[in-house]
Interface confidence: low
């Protein structure tokens, strides 16, 4: 799903207040709900009729450092006999997410939000067929 | 997929540098790759064999203010005849994502990262069957 543009209003102070100096703002350390965890069914990437593989990307100057991307294994979907049926399509499900990028020069460290497109998994869909009349 | 704990190291300065004052850090305004967009197939939530609905939650003190959650429509999956097949399961695909929480008292505005669990869509899986021994 889409993350709307910031429009530079969310991070601004109310109009009656002095502006934020130097184009930066104060970010409190610590993460709200840090212990919250995904509780997905196990091995759904293998058990799905539109199975997928995972690739892990690692960047020490990004939080989270590990970002996992899914890739659909097949064009079609897996039928009850375990065979690929290309009358159906395995398609990726994507999500826009935020990460934090760390930038440092010596002892001067600053952070910036970054939007990342993550493929979370795959789903099996019926292709839309349009015939020219 | 899981976002690991911060461990309070990512947001710290190198050990040889003076500590960050007041438990906060500098976050630059603006978002890297802000124009990046999801390019998912159209209407996959309706065309999927494990279809889902979307619910939008809105919070003006969160960025992004709009967070969209998916809910699987069925317990089973939709077969070629358009009927629900409960020998298969529709299961949610979840993703941990970061949002920014805005906190303000008068002209003092600060921000904090928050972890949110988002259900992005659903996929059709073969159920894990446990036999009683």
């Amino acid at each position: 799903r889409k993350i709307p543009k910031v429009g530079h209003t969310f991070f601004q102070k109310p109009e009656s207040c002095p502006p934020v100096p130097g184009g930066s703002m104060k970010l409190d350390i610590g993460i709200i709900n840090e212990n919250q965890r995904v509780s997905m069914s196990r091995n759904i990437e293998s058990r799905s009729t539109s199975p997928w593989n995972y690739t892990v990307t690692w960047d020490p100057n990004r939080y989270p450092s590990e970002v996992v991307q899914a890739q659909c294994r097949n064009l079609g979907c897996i039928n009850a006999q375990g065979k690929e049926d290309i009358s159906m399509n395995s398609v990726p499900i994507q999500q826009e997410t935020l990460v934090v990028r760390r930038k440092h020069q010596g002892c001067s460290v600053s952070f910036q939000l970054e939007k990342v497109l993550v493929t979370v998994g795959c789903t099996c869909v019926t292709p839309v067929i349009h015939h020219v009349q | 997929r899981k976002i690991p704990k911060v461990g309070h190291t990512f947001f710290q300065k190198p050990e040889s540098c003076p500590p960050v004052p007041g438990g906060s850090m500098k976050l630059d305004i603006g978002i890297i790759n802000e124009n990046q967009r999801v390019s998912m197939s159209r209407n996959i939530e309706s065309r999927s064999t494990s279809p889902w609905n979307y619910t939008v939650t809105w919070d003006p003190n969160r960025y992004p203010s709009e967070v969209v959650q998916a809910q699987c429509r069925n317990l089973g999956c939709i077969n070629a005849q358009g009927k629900e097949d409960i020998s298969m399961n529709s299961v949610p695909i979840q993703q941990e994502t970061l949002v920014v929480r805005r906190k303000h008292q008068g002209c003092s505005v600060s921000f904090q990262l928050e972890k949110v669990l988002v259900t992005v869509g659903c996929t059709c899986v073969t159920p894990v069957i446990h036999h009683v021994q």
């Epitope: 064009l75 399509n89 990726p92 292709p127 349009h130 020219v132 | 197939s41």
Partner: antibody
């Protein structure tokens, strides 16, 4: 009516480049994958390249991989084929064609229901 | 990759006769994704059949497609003068077209 109008063919020396264009009208261009198919003189049809509706997936025949680039501009309802390092064996009549099915990320074809008029590419010194 | 082989290379028949064209795949092909085209000299190909057996819009009912797995057939029940042309089968994939069958007037 539904149509594809091609331009950009001609005579070119081996090793040089050429760009083919295909202008679509009469259908929702950005719903469909599009293809380039060629036919050497007196020979059969050969699929050259295909591109999904959102340019997310692109496919090429082995014979043109690394030399040809397919692209599309949905805002202009146009399909392109950039041909570099041309060889004598690329001499052919080139057709653009519309995919029959709306598919999700395909660059291969299930069937092509609308074809351009064809444009001739001759590679010769 | 799957290779499509069409036979015969040339079919010599008279108007009014029945034409049977064969397309054989080197491996099983989903019948959902086999198509047939007609091409006349100096013209672009024209889609006749998709999904192995469905007629494209505007195609006369004397044209029919059948088959599954590795063997597919295009049948023209009664040849009309305008049917003399080259016919190609096509499958989903990176090398999709067969070599063609020419139907000529005997």
């Amino acid at each position: 009516q539904v149509q594809l109008v091609q331009s950009g063919g001609g005579l070119v020396q081996p090793g040089r480049s050429l760009r083919l264009s295909c202008a679509a009208s009469g259908f929702t261009f950005d719903d469909y994958a599009m293809h380039w198919v060629r036919q050497a003189p007196g020979k059969g049809l050969e699929w050259v390249s295909g591109i999904s509706w959102n340019s997310g997936t692109i496919g090429y025949a082995d014979s043109v991989k690394g030399r040809f680039t397919i692209s599309r501009d949905n805002a202009k309802n146009s399909l392109y084929l950039q041909m570099n390092s041309l060889r004598a064996e690329d001499t052919a009549l080139y057709y653009c064609a519309k995919e029959l099915y709306i598919s999700d990320w395909d660059s291969y074809s299930y069937g092509m229901d609308v074809w351009g008029q064809g444009t001739t590419v001759t590679v010769s010194s | 990759e799957i290779v499509l082989t069409q036979s015969p290379g040339t079919l010599s028949l008279s108007p009014g006769e029945r034409a049977t064209l064969s397309c054989r795949a080197s491996q099983s092909v989903s019948s959902s994704y086999l198509a047939w085209y007609q091409q006349k000299p100096g013209q672009a190909p024209r889609l006749l059949i998709y999904g192995a057996s469905s007629r494209a819009t505007g195609i006369p009912d004397r044209f029919s497609g059948s088959g599954s797995g590795t063997d597919f057939t295009l049948t023209i029940s009664r040849l009309e003068p305008e049917d003399f042309a080259v016919y190609y089968c096509q499958q989903y994939g990176s090398s999709p077209f067969g070599g063609g069958t020419k139907v000529e007037i005997k």
